[in-house]
């Protein structure tokens, strides 16, 4: 009685269960009643990452420097190359096919989370008592200067974009 289903890591062909090729190898010829499945290792710059019956290996991904990409992890016969972005850039998608510059946080906003090769800068508004007077992809909101600790008084209140202006005690307004 010919089988209708095969075990794990096998496939059904010509009413017969043949072994799948292991990751890193491609199928050359199906098994027969008398011979095992014939598999061959993938060539340089090729891979197959599953037990398979593919007759061709996949090409490793190319990390195109013109798109701001670089190799994060070199591919093997069983794994694809992983690309990431050059410094100052991050991927536009999960598959990281191209890169765009990290955004800067505008004045009045600080960096909540610094960008990585795969995620953009996350900005947050500076709350009262903090400020940012620069456009930056790295700077957090900074606290206003405490005039009191310098034996000075506030001459001009801070904003989310400017620090407090301190001055001598005697210049206190009446």
């Amino acid at each position: 009685e010919p089988p209708t289903a095969c075990r794990e890591k096998q496939y059904l062909i010509n009413s017969q269960c043949c072994s799948l090729c292991q990751p890193g190898q491609k199928l050359v010829s199906d098994c027969t009643e008398f011979t095992e499945t014939e598999c061959l290792p993938c060539g340089e710059s090729e891979f197959l990452d599953t037990w398979n019956r593919e007759t061709r290996c996949h090409q490793h991904k190319y990390c195109d420097p013109n798109l701001g990409l670089r190799v994060q992890q070199k591919g093997t016969s069983e794994t694809d190359t992983i690309c990431t972005c050059e410094e100052g850039l991050h991927c536009t998608s999960e598959s990281c096919e191209s890169c765009v510059p990290h955004r800067s946080c505008l004045p009045g906003f600080g960096v909540k989370q610094i960008a990585t090769g795969v995620s953009d800068t996350i900005c947050e508004p500076c709350p009262v008592g903090f400020f940012s007077n620069v456009s930056s992809a790295f700077e957090k909101c900074r606290p206003w200067t405490s005039c009191e600790t310098k034996d000075l008084v506030v001459q001009q209140a801070g904003t989310n974009k400017t620090d407090v202006v301190c001055g001598p005690q005697d210049r206190q307004r009446a």
Epitope: P125, V128, Q155, R173
Partner: antibody, heavy 122, light 113 residues
């Protein structure tokens, strides 16, 4: 102890101005923000603006910009809120409250004046 | 401007009941640098000025009974009265102080059932 005492009730005609005072005691007036909040009859609280008396620095809610002026006199520890071009919708209780004290960590309003009722009616 | 939305607008409850009031901000009030939520809760009785109950979303103001508590982070906050007392029937307001202009929720009136 901290106290904020406001001026008495006022009845005003539409188009006129009102000036409400808030006399502070029990803390360093010049280094703490004074906030002004109003409440129309049966309505919620609405922030109008604030002043840091020592520097004269002010912040105003956009809604009142150009119609409200907040000032302070450090010699008498008194803050003032003047509202011009009054209309009937300005009928409300006006409160002053103490905000941050220069520590930059106490922006909430921990002490309030008793409120001043301003009635705008022709 | 940051909008503050309170719910419910009123609640009927009996003495001893647990009462929960919620407040939602239109943007996060949590600042990553100091991990503080810039939110306060006030109680107001008819004809009186508001009184500060809670600041930094969960810190109890000095002199306020411990049956009052605040919780939440980011955009969603709660004021809880664990066992309602006769003197707690009042209107409650949340307020953010993250950035100007400060804004208040529309208020929640706690009434006697």
């Amino acid at each position: 102890q901290v106290q904020l005492v406001q001026s008495g009730a006022e009845v005003k005609k539409p188009g006129s101005s009102v000036k409400v005072s808030c006399k502070a005691s029990g803390y360093t007036f010049s280094t703490s923000w004074i906030e002004w909040i109003r409440q129309a009859p049966g309505q919620g609280l609405e922030w109008m603006g604030s002043i840091l008396p020592g520097s004269g620095s002010t912040n105003y809610a956009q809604k009142f910009q150009g119609r409200v002026t907040i000032t302070a006199d450090t010699s008498t520890s008194t803050a003032y809120m003047e509202l011009s071009s009054l209309r009937s919708e300005d009928t409300a209780v006006y409160y002053c409250a103490r905000g941050d004290d220069g520590s930059y960590v106490r922006w909430y309003f921990d002490h309030w004046g008793q409120g001043t009722l301003v009635t705008v009616s022709s | 401007d940051i909008q503050m939305t309170q719910s419910p607008s009123s609640v009927s409850a009996s003495v001893g009941d647990r009462v929960t009031i919620t407040c939602r901000a239109s943007q996060s009030l949590l600042f990553s640098v100091n991990q503080k939520n810039y939110l306060a809760w006030y109680q107001q009785k008819p004809g009186k000025a508001p009184k500060l109950l809670i600041y930094w979303a969960s810190s109890l103001q000095s002199g306020v009974p411990s049956r009052f508590s605040g919780s939440g982070s980011g955009t969603d906050f709660t004021l809880t009265i664990s066992s309602l007392q006769p003197e707690d029937f009042a209107t409650y307001y949340c307020q953010h102080y993250y950035s100007y202009p400060w804004t208040f929720g529309q208020g929640t009136k706690v009434e006697i059932k």
